[in-house]
């Protein structure tokens, strides 16, 4: 049903009534684009640090993967964990940070002319909500290896950031993912690894570009927790 899908798309850390029932499968939870909410076209972020429960990598942010927080831990208790940087150990591609992939148990750069031609995945939009095409064509999209010879341009459907051309990342757009521009200095960013800003936003942003990190804007330090603005800033 839509609610079960939207359960992972809700604003989860706002005070009631906006964040009351979220995070419980089957509850009447509804979607909003990430941690955006109305108020003079401002993009507002929340700074509470809470692990976000997940069932699969796609439920986490672009810089996270889904796993048990303890080695050999209960498989039924999984949360979004920070992605692994280059040269760190891994078991699958999703564990590695954007721009890397898992090779022989180690995260390595995917920029070294790497091409995952063996990938053939099918995205089936089987959610409870209606996914109609504007022209009435099929809703089933198969991403075959042929698509990966040229990296996805802006707006192309993708599975992960390494499918996108340089300067783009794979970010959520409704219930699909498309290549969007990596954020530049001064652009508003979403602080990941926080409950409620976990990457299943309907309109998800990319991460900050090389040499930048998502930090609270200096002149917003005095603002309340619920209205802290994060921007991409030089390290």
């Amino acid at each position: 049903t839509l609610n079960s899908v939207l359960n992972s798309n809700a604003i989860k850390n706002l005070p009631p009534p906006l964040g009351g029932a979220a995070g419980h499968p089957g509850s009447a939870v509804s979607a909003a684009p990430g941690i955006l909410y109305p108020g003079g076209n401002k993009y507002q972020t929340i700074d509470n640090y809470q692990p976000y429960p997940c069932a699969e990598d796609e439920e986490c942010g672009t810089d996270e993967y889904c796993a048990s927080p303890t080695r050999g831990g209960d498989a039924g208790v999984q949360i979004c964990l920070a992605c692994r940087k280059r040269r760190k150990r891994c078991m699958r591609h999703a564990m590695c940070c954007p721009g890397n992939y898992c090779k022989n148990g180690i995260c390595v750069s995917s920029d070294q002319n790497h091409f995952r031609g063996e990938i053939e995945e099918t995205i089936t939009e089987s959610f409870g909500n209606d996914h109609s095409t504007l022209d009435g064509y099929s809703r089933r999209t198969t991403l075959s290896s042929k698509m990966y010879h040229t990296k996805g341009q802006e707006g192309s459907v993708c599975l992960r950031s390494s499918d996108c051309a340089s300067g783009l990342c794979c970010a959520r757009h409704f219930w699909s993912k498309i290549c969007k521009p990596v954020l530049k200095e001064g652009q508003v960013c979403t602080k990941h690894r926080r409950k409620g800003s976990h990457g299943l936003e309907i309109f998800q942003r990319c991460y900050c570009g090389e040499g930048l990190s998502c930090r609270i804007q200096k002149d917003h330090h005095q603002a309340s927790n619920s209205s802290r603005l994060h921007t991409c800033q030089r390290h």
């Epitope: 684009p33 990430g34 955006l36 076209n41 993009y43 209606d130 996914h131 109609s132 095409t133 504007l134 022209d135 809703r139 802006e154 707006g155 459907v157 757009h173 409704f174 699909s176 498309i178 969007k180 521009p181 954020l183 530049k184 652009q187 508003v188 309907i202 309109f203 942003r205 990319c206």
Partner: nanobody, 117 residues
């Protein structure tokens, strides 16, 4: 900066219809898509319908499927929500939001829809 302005809300009897409009101005980048959301007192904000210019798809919440229709014109920076067979539970402030290619997301100020029984 993109400004979104909703209009078309009002008071209507159950079973009636309303057509909401959302106009975007100040856009210097293209939009990937736009969506309608609603927030009723004491409830979480809820996704209602969306339209992706990029993917050529429309999306609907179960609660409005078959009653509401989203449409729009990306070139004119406008999106519409045709609401038929309205129910009292559709009463809420309706907001439109935009997914912009300048990496920003924008919200309108909302328009009140009240459905009396």
């Amino acid at each position: 900066e993109v400004q979104l302005v909703e209009s078309g809300g009002g008071l209507v009897q159950a079973g009636g219809s309303l057509r909401l409009s959302c106009a975007a101005s100040g856009r210097t980048f293209s939009s990937y898509g736009m969506g309608w959301f609603r927030h009723a007192p004491g409830k979480e904000r809820e996704f209602v319908a969306g339209i992706s210019w990029t993917l050529g798809r429309t999306y609907y919440a179960d609660s409005v499927k078959g009653r509401f229709t989203i449409s729009g014109d990306n070139a004119k920076n406008t999106v519409y929500l045709q609401m038929n067979s309205l129910k009292p539970e559709d009463t809420a402030v309706y907001y439109c939001a935009s997914d912009e290619s300048d990496a920003a997301n924008y919200w309108g100020q909302g328009t009140q829809v009240t459905v009396s029984s």
